[in-house]
């Protein structure tokens, strides 16, 4: 004969444990039903009656099968630098994540405790490492032959336009100005997708005859160091 299915509450066999979604009540010394997510134990079980569950109140939740006497309070409303990516329901806590342009400077178990604005790279510097949900932008000086004239948390150093005749040489924060109506080539192919700028900015304002006519090939490399260069944009 097959073993009979026990209905809660029931006394477990010595040495055995309660089944899935059941818990052992120390007082009643019985296996009793857990409450489903979104509910809590309103009345604990006895030897003769099973757990009585009730729905969580507004702004409270339980995420797991449980026998807690009260539901957990949802976290406070998301701050102005955050967006609510998961609403507070009876079955889940509110989750706040940083809004676009911000990153999580201090995380918690789920979501973010403290958001901070992503660093913006000033002119002469480009984004070398983009910001993520949990890390800030890293800025690096633009390499020779490249520039950035923006203050931005996304802009990388871009190649100077290549001129037939240079009117004003480019530097780290300014594109080259050509005398002819149009440059021979507006940028080196593929260079815009550089994951991080090579960071020497030396020689950008050196009074050389045509510094932009033969661009450095160093910024065409996918990444990595260029040799230290002697030069100056200094005073």
């Amino acid at each position: 004969l097959p073993a009979q299915v026990a209905f809660t509450p029931y006394a477990p066999e010595p040495g055995s444990t309660c089944r899935l979604r059941e818990y052992y009540d120390q007082t009643a010394q019985m296996c009793c039903s857990k409450c489903s997510p979104g509910q809590h134990a309103k009345v604990f079980c006895t030897k003769t009656s099973d757990t009585v569950c009730d729905s969580c109140e507004d702004s409270t939740y339980t995420q797991l099968w449980n026998w807690v006497p009260e539901c957990l309070s949802c976290g406070s409303r998301c701050s102005s630098d955050q967006v609510e990516t998961q609403a507070c329901t009876r079955e889940q806590n509110r989750i706040c994540t940083c809004r676009p342009g911000w990153y999580c400077a201090l995380s918690k178990q789920e979501g973010c405790r403290l958001c901070a604005p992503l660093r913006k790279c000033r002119p002469g510097f480009g984004v070398a490492r983009p910001g993520t949900e949990t890390s800030d932008v890293v800025c690096k000086p633009c390499a020779p032959g490249t520039f950035s004239n923006t203050t931005s948390s996304t802009d990388i150093c871009r190649p100077h336009q290549i001129c037939n005749v240079v009117a004003i040489p480019g530097n780290a924060s300014m594109d080259a100005v050509c005398t002819s109506t149009s440059p021979t080539r507006s940028m080196a192919p593929g260079a815009v997708h550089l994951p991080q700028p090579v960071s020497t900015r030396s020689q950008h304002t050196q009074p050389t005859p045509e510094p932009s006519t033969a661009p450095s090939t160093s910024f065409l490399l996918p990444m990595g160091p260029s040799p230290p260069a002697e030069g100056s944009t200094g005073d």
């Epitope: 660093r119 000033r122 510097f125 960071s199 020497t200 900015r201 160091p225 230290p228 944009t233 005073d235």
Partner: antibody, heavy 119, light 106 residues
């Protein structure tokens, strides 16, 4: 907390070289460039140049480019500034300062290193 | 190279006074101007960056403003700890400090 700790005072003869160190702590050393600034006794601040510790790339002020060498050792989070062919007018306090390339410039400084050039 | 002309070079004032220090750029530097405070024997301390932005922890009596290529540092009500030397610093094209303003007790 962020700290830049510089090496101690130096006395040098004219024509000699001096190497000043700047040890960084409390932040990711390679995420910031290090500037060097000097100040002669009773005078103003003078920008000398910067180094990007990530690659060792540099940018020097015209005035110093023939005599200064800036280096960095990322394994010990330390930047170095070496000034050669010292003259008496190089007597100054030399400072390092960090810069993350954002508008927030030079937000942390070393305590300064006095270099005295005297025969 | 961009030159920064700072004035006055020295200034006497009393506690509670409103003080202004100006810096003029030889050409446009956008808003890339910072102000530093330096006390004797100490390293400079960043007060204001990007012309207007107050560095964390700096009292709100310090403020920065701009009119064209003229930049101003204002201390609304001088406190005893404010007597020091102040430097402007442009970081738009290269890097250049102003000559400094020594603020002394009258």
């Amino acid at each position: 907390q962020v700290q830049l700790v510089q090496s101690g005072a130096e006395v040098k003869k004219p024509g000699a070289s001096v190497k000043v160190s700047c040890k960084a702590s409390g932040y990711t050393f390679t995420d910031y460039i290090i500037h060097w600034v000097r100040q002669a006794p009773g005078q103003g601040l003078e920008w000398m140049g910067w180094i990007d510790p990530d690659y060792g790339n540099t940018d020097y002020a015209d005035k110093f480019k023939k005599r200064v060498t800036m280096t960095a050792d990322t394994s010990i989070s330390t930047a170095f500034m070496e000034l050669s062919r010292l003259r008496s007018d190089d007597t100054a306090v030399y400072y390092c300062a960090r810069d993350d390339g954002s508008p927030l410039v030079m937000d942390a400084w070393g305590q300064g290193t006095l270099v005295t050039v005297s025969s | 190279d961009i030159q920064m002309t700072q004035s006055p070079s020295s200034l006497s004032a009393s506690v509670g006074d409103r003080v202004t220090i100006t810096c003029q750029g030889s050409q446009n530097i956008d808003n890339y101007l910072a102000w530093f405070q330096q006390k004797p024997g100490k390293a400079p301390k960043l007060l204001i960056y990007s012309t207007y932005s107050l560095q964390t922890g700096v009292p709100s009596r310090f403020s920065g403003s701009r009119s064209g290529t003229d930049f101003t540092l204002t201390i609304s009500s001088l406190q005893p700890e404010d007597f020091a030397t102040y430097f402007c610093f442009q970081y738009n094209q290269g890097y250049m400090f102003g000559g400094g303003t020594k603020l002394e007790l009258k």
